[in-house]
Amino acid sequence: EICGPGIDIRNDYQQLKRLENCTVIEGYLHILLISKAEDYRSYRFPKLTVITEYLLLFRVAGLESLGDLFPNLTVIRGWKLFYNYALVIFEMTNLKDIGLYNLRNITRGAIRIEKNADLCYLSTVDWSLILDAVSNNYIVGNKPPKECGDLCPGTMEEKPMCEKTTINNEYNYRCWTTNRCQKMCPSTCGKRACTENNECCHPECLGSCSAPDNDTACVACRHYYYAGVCVPACPPNTYRFEGWRCVDRDFCANILSAESSDSEGFVIHDGECMQECPSGFIRNGSQSMYCIPCEGPCPKVCEEEKKTKTIDSVTSAQMLQGCTIFKGNLLINIRRGNNIASELENFMGLIEVVTGYVKIRHSHALVSLSFLKNLRLILGEEQLEGNYSFYVLDNQNLQQLWDWDHRNLTIKAGKMYFAFNPKLCVSEIYRMEEVTGTKGRQSKGDINTRNNGERASCESDVLHFTSTTTSKNRIIITWHRYRPPDYRDLISFTVYYKEAPFKNVTEYDGQDACGSNSWNMVDVDLPPNKDVEPGILLHGLKPWTQYAVYVKAVTLTMVENDHIRGAKSEILYIRTNASVPSIPLDVLSASNSSSQLIVKWNPPSLPNGNLSYYIVRWQRQPQDGYLYRHNYCSKDKIPIRKYADGTIDIEEVTENPKTEVCGGEKGPCCACPKTEAEKQAEKEEAEYRKVFENFLHNSIFVPRPE
């Protein structure tokens, strides 16, 4: 049975019975706010294998493990997320282990496991086997690992049953509980799932399967489920629904919208059954299930009840997907996130008009505002105190507003304010004044020339490349030595390069301040000889591949409060030389007569140039007599190597427990005082925790239905 469109179990643990027949929860699962400790042992939902959105657990007293509740939960798809997370376990007072021993895949989103005072077996789970990226997992404030003493099955008896993997350079056994190992598939399966007996599943399976290589035996589907089969795409005249299954037209026509009873019903568009037509399309008549292109831009008006919409995560941005006109104010406050620039563009990239003001503050994850790629008009019907309709404050990594050569943005009413944006050059702000028609509206203090751009090399000169030399996997480039007014201001150069099949890249492509950056960076020191031009050898490149390269001068950014000039080059496109192709693949030879061999092969995976011909060589080989010398069926003929395990028990040193080596001294002393940067990071961390907690509370505390 498919349950949905989301299940919220709260206050009464007996509500869990609603899950009794669910095999798939199409939507989210909340289990929360059950304050009376209960005995959950009689509750078991072995049928549940998939949650299509996210799983949230919050303040459920008495629940010690999720393994008994959901022994077969295999996949959380994360089609919609809870504040960027697909699994949230928060303030679960009695939870001792997660125990979801069959959980094999979280398709999208990260995990957040926080403030669970009794929760152990966290360091024994290798989340990289379950999620694509573990960098955004947030596992904080749980039982300290030293107090847990997590032991995987069999380790006490010195008969370890679980497999080992490396996490943070620690090679260790992986398990969910004291008696449940973390399942790993044989390396021969690659990205495929496997059965309990380690046989590889069909490529369309996700998580697990009951029989090998069979698309009807999957526990969950990698792409879509239709009529008992996992399929890579929905068959003709069936439609993608909720990101995981294919439905027919009748099904789509009969869905009642969970959001509102007066909605016009779902539509079918480009092979998907969806709640409403996407941006650029409109229903073909009010009763129609089909969308037609709008003549010109067709507005999708989105309105915020509270007038101001705060964008502080991917989840909050998700609410604006498809909106072209936003009635209200936008407050953007993005402190962190994975791949945040492209996620924000995905959800906010269609907004053309904001009727109120736009405020961007403390958005340290942003390098550019180009994710608002269609914003053309800020009406300023509502303004911030001081009559500001565009307000940019304290964005530590913001370097670019928009690409003004390709951008028309009008601010109809209101002023602009910029302060404490250390990497945002004032010239960029002045350019915005000109483009938006706000020049002359701002007073002197509205654009702070001291603290905007103080950590950037502004007023850039152009660096010119002087020579380029290529080989199959190297590029040597040199450029004119840059001479700022005072040569001491020039520190070094940074070379940025990346593969660029097309000549259409920009400096800020795919860049955010949280480490997502599509450019590789190399620092180049100044040549000691002032007459030698600086240059670099880029090596380890792919043959016959076009690269984009540009260079920036790294300069001291302030000299007695005057901005000094920086320098950077244009983007240069350069292709490495062709090289020897990789070996042809899948070489097969078969004899079809006593004097002929038929040899077949596939092209190499890396042609490294334009292939013109193949060379086939052969030679007669003598029969190898060595093959007959050993009886390979006899065990004693094969030497068995034994290795010392090299472990020695060392007692922990306990004297002077509160000491650290600090400064230049070698003796015990007080802990070093925290640096300003550390204090700032801690402050931001605490702030981020608060923001999440507020989001959680705002999402789950709702008035009782009357």
Epitope: P235, P236, N237, D248, R249, D250, A253, G271, Y290
Partner: antibody
Framework: QVQLKESGPGLVAPSQSLSITCTVS????????VSWIRQPPGKGLEWLGV???????YYHSPLKSRLSITKDNSKSQVFLKMNSLQTDDTAMYYC????????WGQGTSVTVSS | DIVMTQSQKFMSTSVGDRVSVTCKAS??????VAWYQHKPGHSPKPLIY???YRYSGVPDRFTGSGSGTDFTLTINNVQSEDLAEYFC?????????FGAGTKLELK
């Protein structure tokens, strides 16, 4: 397994009506739709319309005024009725399982001639 | 209506050759395109759906590619049983439409 079979009159006089029956097995007409397609001699395939599991229909607009698709779920039969036939309606008429378009009948030949 | 144009009515080939049949849609149909093989006296046999996925039982010498408006059916190592007419079909928008067909014949 899934099967569809068309049965029709073969020959129809101009201005008369055409009735073809498509009998299906291996799937339920409550759950799945059936499409009708035709192919005039020497020409390509032309989609005529569909009846879905829930009985809704959609007709190709040039034929809308003279086309009707109905069904009898209990007998697993779908019916195509076309009025005012002309010689250019001469074609091979096929029914197909709409969802998937992966199962087609063998077709029934219809000639419009006096 | 979306027009599916198969510009070549006939294509000549030899057994063992590789042949590509093309189809162009008059507007974007994403990847909602299928290919059918049709032999005289038989019903059309589905080969490819969603532009590039084979229906079960279809030999892997048949491959489909393309998205948007341009689509290709490629037959590697043509066999004698592949000599037939090939139709493309869009199911992105109603009415569903088919190409005029491309007949594959021996040189």
């Amino acid at each position: 397994q899934v099967q569809l079979k068309e049965s029709g009159p073969g020959l129809v006089a101009p201005s008369q009506s055409l009735s073809i029956t498509c009998t299906v097995s291996g799937f339920s007409l409550n759950e799945y739709g059936v499409s009708w397609i035709r192919q005039p001699p020497g020409k390509g395939l032309e989609w005529l319309g569909v009846i879905w599991g829930g009985r809704d229909t959609y007709y190709h607009s040039p034929l809308k005024s003279r086309l009707s698709i109905t069904k009898d779920n209990s007998k697993s039969q779908v019916f195509l009725k076309m009025n005012s036939l002309q010689t250019d309606d001469t074609a091979m008429y096929y029914c197909a399982k709409h969802e998937g378009m992966d199962y087609w009948g063998q077709g029934t030949s219809v000639t419009v001639s006096s | 209506d979306i027009v599916m144009t198969q510009s070549q009515k006939f294509m000549s080939t030899s057994v063992g050759d590789r042949v590509s049949v093309t189809c162009k849609a008059s507007q974007n149909v994403v990847t909602n395109v299928a290919w059918y093989q049709h032999k005289p006296g038989h019903s059309p046999k589905p080969l490819i759906y969603s532009a590039s996925y084979r229906y079960s039982g279809v030999p892997d010498r048949f491959t489909g590619s393309g998205s948007g408006t341009d689509f290709t059916l490629t037959i590697n190592n043509v066999q004698s049983e592949d000599l037939a007419e090939y139709f493309c079909h869009q199911y992105n928008n109603f009415p569903l439409t088919f190409g005029a067909g491309t007949k594959l014949e021996l040189k």
